[in-house]
């Protein structure tokens, strides 16, 4: 229904706290370099304005769209051009082009320092002094680094953050309480960020239909007892919600997400038997809980998929007359039977089925042509199953760090032109798949592995798109979203690559490495490993193992030495010489 004042409507629906949080996220995602203080000033102005519109919907400017109101606020910022360059050109445009322009200027890799968590004591002090400001900083810092973070979910993580601090700041050993809990929130949030970026990429590159297909498969796996019409309704709503968030309509997105949660809880009987526990929670937790809900039990009496999709005489007629409904039904039926498959795999199977019908239906004897289609799925299913098996075996053998290194070598060989920091980030994230998925029960491994890898590879594609350097990466990234992971897996050593010259300074280290946290130490070593592979793309596993082992010993030895600086200065050149020799 149309409202006189959109902003008043959203303020009333969301409440002041969530309204302010969402406006802060929106501004932080659009203008990623502005300091918190500047954004919070704008947030307060927008909130005050919203309140005047709540009091009187006919007040001046209250009838303007939220994009217009937000855009006008952003464009009024002094020195916008000085800080943001060509983003300021967006301000010359009218809506909706102005918002589109802002979206295009979102930076997936902003030049911001890594978010440093303060010491436990300092954290607790500033949290207790002003919890609102503390959590505001959290929203701001995460949102500006992740300009596509799913806004209502970020509010949920801020709430989690709040809970952890409230609980731990009263403990005697604050750090012991805070560290593991905040690490867990951070890990979940980072995974959420790459997953949401993939959803926005899907929406941006392939449109709503592609996203809706993803949603149908996912919902069908989770709610196998729901009718196709119910799944379609849920998928349509989820598509709308994600489109809004990806498009910067954060207030509408959060409002619609809350509405969907309400609908699901009011219609549990036709959706799933597993929803009740979620439905007793407050709105943010409720939506999050529903998004993470375990799969319902598959109905016991499901007939063979072949009946309606191979054996039925009307297959081709049904396909030609309403592809969306017929193929949507196929995807639904196949997905509800296979919670053990990844969504990517299910979409590949649906695509194969569609391609087979498109090829066969105009022929003289269509059933003879498409009759073996389900058997032809076998290689498509085996490929990711083998991927999971071999990678989980390797992970179990090497552990997370060793597995990350194996992945780093593999990907540096596939795409040596890609910058080392990007390769290291990608490999570290890809390598975490082991810890995340390989410990799960067999039936959950494949969906966990492949859908996680797809999200990480999407991040690689997004970064590569900004500065394309590898034809192979461009090729894999410009194809269909569901084919990306198999495309990357199939890449081999890039034979066209001219090895990098050996630069001694790349492998020169100083005593500062000794005081780095373990994670930073690992990154230093992995950076050196990627550079070694770029220097010798065809180095054997044994050669790399020797050099890296030597390197680890060298760091260990010098960090234990009385005169660390001297040790690094004298032993470093020896290490470089030995490494060159080992790789010759």
């Amino acid at each position: 229904e149309a409202h006189k004042s959109e902003i008043a409507h959203r303020f009333k629906d969301l409440g002041e706290q969530h309204f302010k949080g969402l406006v802060l996220i929106a501004f932080s995602q659009y203008l990623q370099k502005c300091p918190y203080e500047e954004h919070i000033k704008l947030v307060q102005e927008v909130t005050d304005f919203a309140k005047t519109c709540v009091a009187d919907e006919n007040a001046e400017n209250c009838d303007k769209s939220i994009h217009t109101l937000f855009g006008d606020k952003l464009c009024a910022i002094p020195k916008l051009r000085d800080n943001y360059g060509e983003l300021a050109d967006c301000c010359a445009k009218q809506e909706p082009e102005r918002n589109e322009c802002f979206l295009q200027h979102k930076d997936d890799n902003p030049n911001l320092p890594p978010f440093q968590r303060p010491e436990a004591e300092a954290m607790c002090t500033s949290f207790q002094e002003n919890p609102t400001s503390f959590l505001g900083h959290y929203l701001h810092e995460v949102a500006r680094r992740h300009p596509y973070f799913y806004a209502p979910e970020l509010l949920y993580y801020a709430e989690k953050y709040n809970e952890v601090l409230t609980q731990c700041c009263t403990e005697s050993d604050k750090a012991a309480c805070l560290t593991p809990k905040l690490d867990a929130v951070k890990e979940k949030a980072l995974v959420a960020a790459v997953r949401q970026r993939m959803k926005c990429s899907s929406m941006q590159r392939f449109g709503e239909r592609a996203f809706k297909a993803w949603a149908v498969a996912r919902m069908s796996q989770r709610f196998p007892n729901a009718e196709f019409a119910e799944i379609t309704k849920l998928a349509t709503d989820v598509t709308k919600i994600n489109k809004e968030c990806c498009h910067g309509d954060l207030l509408e997105c959060a409002d619609d997400r809350a509405e969907l949660a309400k609908y699901m809880c009011e219609n549990q009987a036709t959706i799933s038997s597993k929803l009740q526990a979620c439905c007793d929670k407050p709105v943010l937790q409720k939506s999050q809980c529903l998004a993470e809900i375990e799969h319902d039990n598959i109905p016991a009496d499901l007939p063979s998929i072949a009946a309606d999709f191979v054996e039925d005489k009307e297959v081709c007629k049904n396909y030609a007359e309403a592809k969306d409904v017929f193929l949507g039904t196929f995807l639904y039926e196949y997905s509800r039977r296979h919670p053990d498959y990844s969504v990517s795999l299910l979409l590949r199977l649906a695509k194969k089925y569609e391609a087979t019908l498109e090829k066969c239906c105009a022929e003289g004897d269509p059933p003879a042509c498409y009759g073996t289609v389900l058997a032809e799925f076998q290689p498509l299913v085996e490929e990711p199953k083998n991927l999971v098996k071999t990678n989980c075996e390797l992970y179990e053998k090497l552990g997370e760090y060793g597995f990350q290194n194996a992945v780093l070598v593999r990907y540096t060989q596939k795409a040596p032109q890609v910058s080392t920091p990007t390769l290291v980030e990608a490999a570290r994230n890809l390598g975490r798949v082991g810890t995340k998925c390989c410990t799960l029960p067999e039936a959950q491994r494949l969906p966990c592995v492949e859908d996680y890898l797809s999200a990480i590879l999407n991040r690689l594609c997004v970064l590569h798109e900004k500065t394309p350097v590898s034809e192979k990466v461009t090729k894999c990234c410009s194809g269909s979203l569901v084919e990306r992971r198999p495309c990357f897996s199939a890449l081999t050593v890039d034979e066209t690559y001219v090895p990098k010259e050996f630069k001694a300074e790349t492998f020169t280290f100083h005593s500062d490495i000794c005081t780095l946290p373990d994670k930073e130490k690992q990154i230093k070593k992995q950076t050196a490993l990627a550079e070694l592979v770029k220097h010798k793309p065809k180095a054997t596993e044994d050669q790399l193992k020797t050099v890296m082992g030597d390197f680890a010993q060298f760091v260990d030895k010098c960090c234990k030495a009385a005169d660390k600086d001297n040790c690094f200065a004298t032993e470093g050149p020896n290490l470089v010489a030995r490494s060159k020799e080992a790789l010759a």
Partner: antibody, heavy 118, light 110 residues
Amino acid sequence: QSLEESGGRLVTPGTPLTLTCTVSGIDLSNYAINWVRQAPGKGLEWIGIIWASGTTFYATWAKGRFTISRPSTTVDLEMTSLTTADTATYFCARTVPGYSTAPYFDLWGPGTLVTVSS
Amino acid sequence: AAVLTQTPSPVSAAVGGTVTINCQSSPSVWSNFLSWYQQKPGQPPKLLIYEASKLTSGVPSRFKGSGSGTQFTLTISDVQCGDAATYYCGGGYSSISDTTFGGGTKVVVK
């Protein structure tokens, strides 16, 4: 491989008319054939398709007045209740092999002109 | 019913120049089921491009198709006199019954 339309002529409104598409060098049991028309000085308009299996589909606007059939080695387009708006050159065209529902027509006849006038 | 809207029409270009023709679809075409045809007076149309960007064999690489979803473009670079013709886009949709063509764009070469 070629297609050729025939049967186009001047008819009065309301008269039924059947056009024929004769194929040579093409095995109709393997290909889909479409009918497309073009009013003088206007754009192309898809009428319908017959698959190799004999299954037919029509444009929403063409359902009921147009019938596509395949008596033997020809493909016919039967038209009823003709009006002056049906005046056009009628083409038959083959769908690119390997496609069933896509608008990819790689082989066309030269067309036959149908004039509906009183 | 599906609609394909072509712009501009007519369009003129000098020999050696570049011509861009747009084709907007409502709703989205199905699975990039979009084609481009060239038609010269008194002749049937000729298929140039299918699946939005794939060139039919024998068609010069000066013809390039791009786009997806609802927005598609045919670009003719290094225009020749023989390229003077009317160009049509054709779209396939969820229902085969919605198959349709754009209104056509006449290209005049000077």
